[in-house]
Amino acid sequence: ESLGTEQRVVGRAAEVPGPEPGQQEQLVFGSGDAVELSCPPPGGGPMGPTVWVKDGTGLVPSERVLVGPQRLQVLNASHEDSGAYSCRQRLTQRVLCHFSVRVTDAPSSGDDEDGEDEAEDTGVDTGAPYWTRPERMDKKLLAVPAANTVRFRCPAAGNPTPSISWLKNGREFRGEHRIGGIKLRHQQWSLVMESVVPSDRGNYTCVVENKFGSIRQTYTLDVLERSPHRPILQAGLPANQTAVLGSDVEFHCKVYSDAQPHIQWLKHVEVNGSKVGPDGTPYVTVLKSWISESVEADVRLRLANVSERDGGEYLCRATNFIGVAEKAFWLSVHGPRAAEEELVEADEAGSVYAG
């Protein structure tokens, strides 16, 4: 079972709804526990086919590894099951949920294991560097939403006291190598990067050395970027329809938006014989309006028992905090005979669809 304290469960990738906000979820399990990872669909909408990945490799279901679209179970966990797990959309490979799982030797308990960072005095007069808390050094991948802060730590000891230096992708890493610089605390064996951006992605290595030896640790940083954009709309085909009087018509509009979109179905109307207002803005009437909770919404407008009055231009409009997107749909309503003739003409000409 996972630990329910905030110290243990600290969030997930910015794209994902989860128990704790906006970040990677870090979980600690005891040896022999069942690792259970849950990834509900964003906004409660449809999930679509997913794939579970550990340390970049797709997980193969087995008697011990149970894979479902929203849930992963690893039974009788061992240290080898530690790592970076993610649930991705199979088609786009978009990361829906990201977890850092650590399996410790001891069975899990609710107690916080945080203690002093300093190892007990070993009484050794001289010696090569060593990690003071090696059990804390086993997590290697850090996935962080852009604009947050990252700290890498490599607490070590040795006699004489070792020095620490940092590499990025195998090369010396200094403050001038990134906008915003870096902050080093040698006494805390740490490197801090504020307000990370995608260019900060890479492998970061601490090198700890004295005259008796050298140790190093490499961490991989992934910066999860939400590229904010206005909603993307895709019109369901056919976008333009001809309907018989009294029949039912349905328009489809697919809305993609990372940020919560406000979706509306509108119809162009005339007011006092005019289609536009004094400022040139078209007159519209709102048929449906709601806030979508999901990243991907398939929205429909159903018109029952259509009359000639229902003919005209319809709009699917989606607005988020970045901007607005619209798709136009046309409906022609005719009596039975006229509609049949129009359909024949459309067949001969090839159907015309809006982009």
Partner: antibody, heavy 127, light 107 residues
């Protein structure tokens, strides 16, 4: 320029409700969190709760859990604090603050830092 | 909840003085400690995070130190704009908790 502007404060009777708004600008709303912190007259600061607008995930102080709800509308870049069943002890200036995480593999928690604050809005609960 | 205790509750000092405020946590909070400054009628401002990291734009006369349970905020040379109330805050545990504040007044 990062800005947070609270609104919606006022006088309300015990047991009543109020909704505070926090309009954010000057930063990517979906990357970081929004925290609410309150300060009773002449007293210190008390953390109320936090939301990450992208996911809608929230955390609350025990003193307000079940009575207060934090939400966000990313289309408006605005976070909200819905306060129900208000009590006299909820009287305070309420601040919203942009909140970011400090991620550190070495420890099993994320440190949350509130780097930009709004000017505050006063909520008075009195009959 | 983790209790944060600041001392002193208030102090009087003169411009140019070196001022030290301490904050003690009821349990180990590693280095997960921030310091904020608040002037009357204004919102708090972040000074220090992670115990010792100066936040962008904060003058270098402010410094923080400590880890575990004992932390210190030092103002090396007090300036007129530094007369204010200072709060420490931890965020390793849920909920985040603040100290009761230290008011720095003009002597």
């Amino acid at each position: 320029e990062v800005q947070l502007v609270e609104s919606g404060g006022g006088l309300v009777q015990p047991g009543g409700s109020l909704r505070l708004s926090c309009a954010a600008s000057g930063f990517t709303f979906t990357s970081t969190g929004i925290s609410w912190v309150r300060q009773a007259p002449g007293k210190g600061l008390e953390w109320v709760g936090r939301i990450y607008p992208t996911s809608g995930s929230t955390n609350y102080a025990d003193s307000v859990k079940g009575r207060f709800t934090i939400s966000a509308d990313t289309s408006k870049n605005t976070a909200y604090l819905q306060m129900n069943s208000l009590r006299a002890e909820d009287t305070a200036v309420y601040y919203c603050a942009r909140t970011y995480g400090i991620y550190d593999l070495y420890v099993d928690y994320t440190e949350y830092v509130m780097d930009y604050w709004g000017q505050g809005t006063l909520v008075t609960v009195s009959s | 909840d983790i209790q944060m205790t600041q001392s002193p509750s208030s102090l009087s000092a003169s411009v140019g003085d070196r001022v030290t405020i301490t904050c003690r946590a009821s349990q180990d909070v590693d280095t997960s400690l921030a310091w904020y400054k608040q002037k009357p009628g204004k919102a708090p401002k972040l000074l220090i995070y992670s115990a010792s990291f100066l936040y962008s734009g904060v003058p270098s006369r402010f410094s923080g130190s400590g880890s575990g349970t004992d932390f210190t905020l030092t103002i090396s040379s007090l300036q007129p704009e530094d007369f204010a109330t200072y709060y420490c805050q931890q965020s390793t545990g849920h909920p985040q908790t603040f100290g009761q504040g230290t008011k720095v007044e003009i002597k």
